[in-house]
């Protein structure tokens, strides 16, 4: 599992494999913070529940982040 135990970033290594949404169960988005300077995308895979860190610079993830932030702004009080 490419997760670190430090108080800094959660992801040690990032998968550059193209994302097929069908292989994913869920995605967790951890925004950049004082602990980690970059946004982190942790995918839980359907098979075996393995966790994988995805590349936030990939086109697919950039589109996802845009969609999520759009949803967020719609629901903000």
């Amino acid at each position: 599992v490419p997760l670190s135990r430090t108080v800094r970033c959660t992801c040690i290594s990032i998968s550059n494999q193209p994302v097929n949404p069908r292989s994913l169960e869920k995605l967790e988005i951890i925004p950049a913070s004082q602990f980690c300077p970059r946004v982190e995308i942790i995918a839980t895979m359907k098979k075996k529940g393995e966790k994988r860190c995805l590349n936030p610079e990939s086109k697919a993830i950039k589109n996802l982040l845009k969609a999520v932030s759009k949803e967020r702004s719609k629901r903000s009080p």
């Epitope: 994302v19 069908r22 967790e28 988005i29 098979k47 086109k59 999520v68």
Partner: antibody, heavy 134, light 110 residues
């Protein structure tokens, strides 16, 4: 009312280009995958490929890779299936269908989540017939 | 030739119970769920069964599905004349990285 409406079919000469449209209404377009299926005369259903508007990426059946392009315009909730050069063997009824669901939750926390479920193609368009003939 | 194997035809009389089989492999049905679609003459297909045995709302409980190993089954009990249609099974195939269908079964109500 949740629906998909295809358009753009008709009689086309071999070698010509064509773009089919699939207009969605009654649901949040970017929260689902849109799949294209064809039903050639006398044969069974064939999966062409799908697009996930939330990710902006398309996947294709090996048979159709490089032969067609699937795209989407989120601003008008419409998916497209495009050919640059049609063949007689492309003659079929073409359907778009709604597939995988992408639920965004915990939006107001510091860790939003996207949960993904593929529970079958639950909404289909009426179909559009493409006849490739000279 | 289809990746999933279905009998090309099936038949039954009104009130009878009919089973349609769908045979696959470890890369599709063996590791993914089975869906069933009904295609009535002149109409678009509709989802009949998803996740092996779940019925979408509006589908009568005469239709049921199951999965065992690398095969799926659709059972129609209390057959009615309006059930005359083509039935397709479908699954995801991890090797082909795509959705796969059976060749379809034409159901005739005698």
């Amino acid at each position: 009312q949740v629906q998909l409406v295809e358009s753009g079919g008709g009689v086309v000469q071999p070698g010509r280009s064509l773009r089919l449209s699939c207009a969605a209404s009654g649901f949040t377009f970017s929260s689902f995958s849109i799949t294209w299926i064809r039903d050639p005369p006398g044969k069974g259903l064939e999966w062409i490929g799908e697009i996930t508007p939330m990710f902006g990426i398309a996947f294709y059946a090996q048979k159709f890779q490089g032969q067609v392009t699937i795209s989407a315009d989120k601003s008008i909730s419409t998916a497209y299936l495009q050919w640059s050069s049609l063949k007689a063997s492309d003659t079929a009824m073409y359907y778009c269908a709604r597939d995988g669901r992408f639920d965004v939750s915990d939006l107001l926390t510091d860790k939003p989540k996207v949960t993904i479920n593929y529970n079958g193609m639950d909404v289909w368009g009426q179909g559009t017939l493409v006849t490739v003939s000279s | 030739q289809s990746v999933l194997t279905q009998p090309p035809s099936a038949s039954g009389t009104p009130g009878q119970r009919v089973t349609i089989s769908c045979s696959g492999s470890s890369s599709n049905i063996g590791s993914n769920t089975v869906n069933w679609y009904q295609e009535l003459p002149g109409a678009a297909p509709q989802l009949l069964i998803y996740n092996n045995d779940q019925r979408p709302s509006g589908i009568p409980d005469r239709f049921s599905g199951s999965k065992s190993g690398t095969s799926g089954s659709l059972v129609i009990s209390g057959l009615q004349s309006e059930d005359e249609a083509d039935y397709y099974c479908a699954s995801w195939d991890d090797s082909l990285n795509g959705r796969v269908f059976g060749g379809g079964t034409k159901l005739t109500v005698l």
